[in-house]
């Protein structure tokens, strides 16, 4: 039905093409493994069209199946560093509402300094996605090395 | 508005679904770190629907947000080779027009022989994407190991 | 033309937005390198909207260009394990019909325990995709570590 309305020239938002690409703002305080994200036209090539940021975490505004993708690069890192400080792990999941909490995507760095992956997953309005980086190494904030995004694919 | 015209049965191109998937043609001459790509029906499973190739580099024909993805595998490579020849780095960026030059995506191989990633980024008509591979190792030209593509996602 | 029909309020399936995200069910018997997948609402966050499973392999129902993505994580794995058991390789390809058999995507684990990649590729109705994992290490069945999916992008 959403697509049936195309003839009425409704704005793209009504077509359901929510999309966001975020850059790293900062890491969390003590005992908080979350990465905090930022996005918007004043911040280079990051943007939010539909989803919103809630205290640095991405909140979904439209039900549907989404492509979620992420790349995280560790700063001042070599394969020796990465293996010496193993395990360093990144997990992307729904962290709220608590009733829907689940890990969607998980990767370890092993002897590498970058992880990158993507997956399709159903998300609902109000779902907040968190990206947890556990370990002793800090991520790069360079916008071409660390980024996180979602793309609405279909209802 | 583009979608509002769907009822007029315009060709898909007018809907803005530009997409391309390229295979490696060759590497650049001395001092040129760029990879040169090729695509088209005569070349197996690569294709260009909208974007064009300009001297082996991908040129965008439609403004919008794109999903850019790449995989590069180093030829005759083992983890020992990769670490011995470290750093080998791949960067994808807008290389022209010069005023819009920026790195979009960067990865190092460390002890691995393949990198793969993807990201959402705004691109404008006329933007040319370059993929720079720096280091002493050469990429595989196997079409299932090394490829580069873009997909228009929304205006 | 498919999009021109939007005004008739046809179901999404007629718009061609076929999509699937699968989780690992089991590995094949001796001499069968294939991974066997499962998906559906009863299985957490996996789903099939359009494509079907045929004995654990993904069969395409609609011609078009697809984004194919995969992540496979090896179970009980460290970088030492991965390098000691090298080569462990994952290949995604069309395995039937035999006349269209081709490898689409190939990655080796080297010193890592996870591979993840994605690519655009034309697929035709009836194409069956197989994911072959060769080597002595077994994949994790955790749904956030090993998954495989496709998304219809355009005709």
């Amino acid at each position: 039905q959403r697509f049936a309305q195309a003839q009425q020239q409704l704005p793209l938002e009504s077509l359901g093409w929510d999309v966001a690409e975020l850059q790293l703002n900062h890491t969390g305080p003590q005992q908080d493994p979350r990465l905090y994200w930022q996005g918007g036209p004043a911040l280079g090539r990051s943007f939010l069209h539909g989803p919103e940021l809630d205290k640095g975490q991405l909140r979904i505004h439209r039900d549907g199946i989404y492509m979620v993708h992420i790349q995280v690069t560790l700063a001042i890192c070599s394969s020796t560093t990465a293996s010496r400080h193993h395990p360093t792990t990144l997990a992307v999941g729904i962290c709220s509402p608590a009733s829907r909490s689940i890990s969607l995507l998980r990767l370890s760095f092993h002897q590498g300094c970058t992880i990158a992956s993507q997956r399709l997953t159903p998300l609902a309005r109000g779902d907040t996605l968190c990206t947890n980086l556990t370990g002793t190494l800090l991520p790069s904030r360079n916008t071409d090395e660390t980024f996180f995004g979602v793309q609405w694919v279909r209802p | 508005q583009r979608f509002a015209q769907a009822q007029q049965q315009l060709p898909l191109e007018s809907l803005g679904w530009d997409v391309a998937e390229l295979q490696l043609n060759h590497t650049g001459p001395q001092q040129d770190p760029r990879l040169y790509w090729q695509g088209g029906p005569a070349l197996g499973r690569s294709f260009l629907h909208g974007p064009e190739l300009d001297k082996g580099q991908l040129r965008i024909h439609r403004d919008g947000i794109y999903m850019v993805h790449i995989q590069v595998t180093l030829a005759i490579c083992s983890s020992t080779t990769a670490s011995r020849h470290h750093p080998t780095t791949l960067a994808v960026g807008i290389c022209s027009p010069a005023s819009r030059s920026i790195s979009l995506l960067r990865l190092s191989f460390h002890q691995g022989c393949t990198i793969a990633s993807q990201r959402l980024t705004p691109l404008a008509r006329g933007d040319t994407l370059c993929t720079n591979l720096t280091g002493t190792l050469l990429p595989s030209r196997n079409t299932d190991e090394t490829f580069f593509g873009v997909q228009w996602v929304r205006p | 033309q498919r999009f021109a029909q939007a005004q008739q309020q046809l179901p999404l399936e007629s718009l061609g937005w076929d999509v699937a995200e699968l989780q690992l069910n089991h590995t094949g018997p001796q001499q069968d390198p294939r991974l066997y997948w499962q998906g559906g609402p009863a299985l957490g966050r996996s789903f099939l909207h359009g494509p079907e499973l045929d004995k654990g392999q993904l069969r395409i129902h609609r011609d078009g260009i697809y984004m194919v993505h995969i992540q496979v994580t090896l179970a009980i794995c460290s970088s030492t394990t991965a390098s000691r058991h090298h080569p462990t390789t994952l290949a995604v390809g069309i395995c039937s019909p035999a006349s269209r058999s081709i490898s689409l995507l190939r990655l080796s684990f080297h010193q890592g325990c996870t591979i993840a990649s994605q690519r655009l590729t034309p697929l035709a109705r009836g194409d069956t995709l197989c994911t072959n994992l060769t080597g002595t290490l077994l994949p994790s069945r955790n749904t956030d570590e090993t998954f495989f999916g496709v998304q219809w992008v355009r005709p």
């Epitope: 790293l24 890491t27 305080p29 003590q30 001042i76 190494l137 800090l138 | 750093p87 720096t134 | -």
Partner: antibody
Framework: QVQLVQSGAEVKKPGASVKVSCKAS????????MHWVRQAPGQGLEWMGW????????SYAQQFQGRVTMTRDTSMSTVYMELTRLRADDTAVYYC????????????WGQGTLVTVSS | DIQMTQSPSSLSASVGDRVTITCQAS??????LNWYQQKPGKVPNLLIY???NLETGVPSRFSGSGSGTDFTFTISSLQPEDIATYYC?????????FGQGTRLEIK
């Protein structure tokens, strides 16, 4: 504003140990690596290692491995660098520094602590 | 470890001169290179980060360029207050390493 305040100068005998402190203020202490860099009299800069104040994890330069220990007290927003088995060529000014790297903007240094090793 | 070789180790120039210092890395370090100024008895001060970006508050007569293994630091018009030692520093790979320094004095 960001400030890194180090402990005062020390005079030590060869074979002894020294522990230098660095108190941080004006920023999120656990959000950045704290580095230690030393400079011998009339010489260049030499990186010793970093500590992640959030996790306590460390990375040391090879030449200091086994002799240096970096620790932190998050309640005091303070990091410590202890160097053992001191030699005459360890005589240097020791700096704690929140160095710029990989988009983590702001480059701040403590005032330096002169450690003199002499018999 | 990555060796950073600076040249020259010292140089003398006149006020208003264009001054160039080079830094060569023993292996490719992308653009992960910073330039510091250290005046006698003072702490180092970051001038240029990531090879070519001017740190906030630093005069525009300072600039940097290069990528990979070869980098250049330039003062377009030398001022008396620029008398200092200049260091390049890489952070691509641990350990972080500094060049040996270039001592700059006025003729």
């Amino acid at each position: 504003q960001v400030q890194l305040v180090q402990s005062g100068a020390e005079v030590k005998k060869p074979g002894a140990s020294v522990k230098v402190s660095c108190k941080a203020s004006g920023y999120s202490f656990t959000g950045y690596y704290m580095h230690w860099v030393r400079q011998a009299p009339g010489q260049g800069l030499e990186w010793m290692g970093w500590i992640n104040p959030k996790s306590g994890g460390t990375s040391y330069a090879q030449q200091f491995q086994g002799r240096v220990t970096m620790t932190r007290d998050t309640s005091m927003s303070t990091v410590y660098m202890e160097l053992t088995r001191l030699r005459a060529d360890d005589t240097a000014v020791y700096y704690c520094a929140r160095l710029y790297y990989s988009g983590w903007y702001g480059d701040y240094w403590g005032q330096g602590t002169l450690v003199t090793v002499s018999s | 470890d990555i060796q950073m070789t600076q040249s020259p180790s010292s140089l003398s120039a006149s006020v208003g001169d264009r001054v160039t210092i080079t830094c060569q890395a023993s292996q490719d370090i992308n653009n992960y290179l910073n330039w510091y100024q250290q005046k006698p008895g003072k702490v180092p001060n970051l001038l240029i980060y990531d090879a070519s970006n001017l740190e906030t508050g630093v005069p525009s007569r300072f600039s940097g360029s290069g990528s990979g293994t070869d980098f250049t630091f330039t003062i377009s018009s030398l001022q008396p207050e620029d008398i200092a030692t200049y260091y390049c520093q890489q952070y691509n790979n641990p350990p972080i390493t500094f060049g040996q320094g270039t001592r700059l004095e006025i003729k």
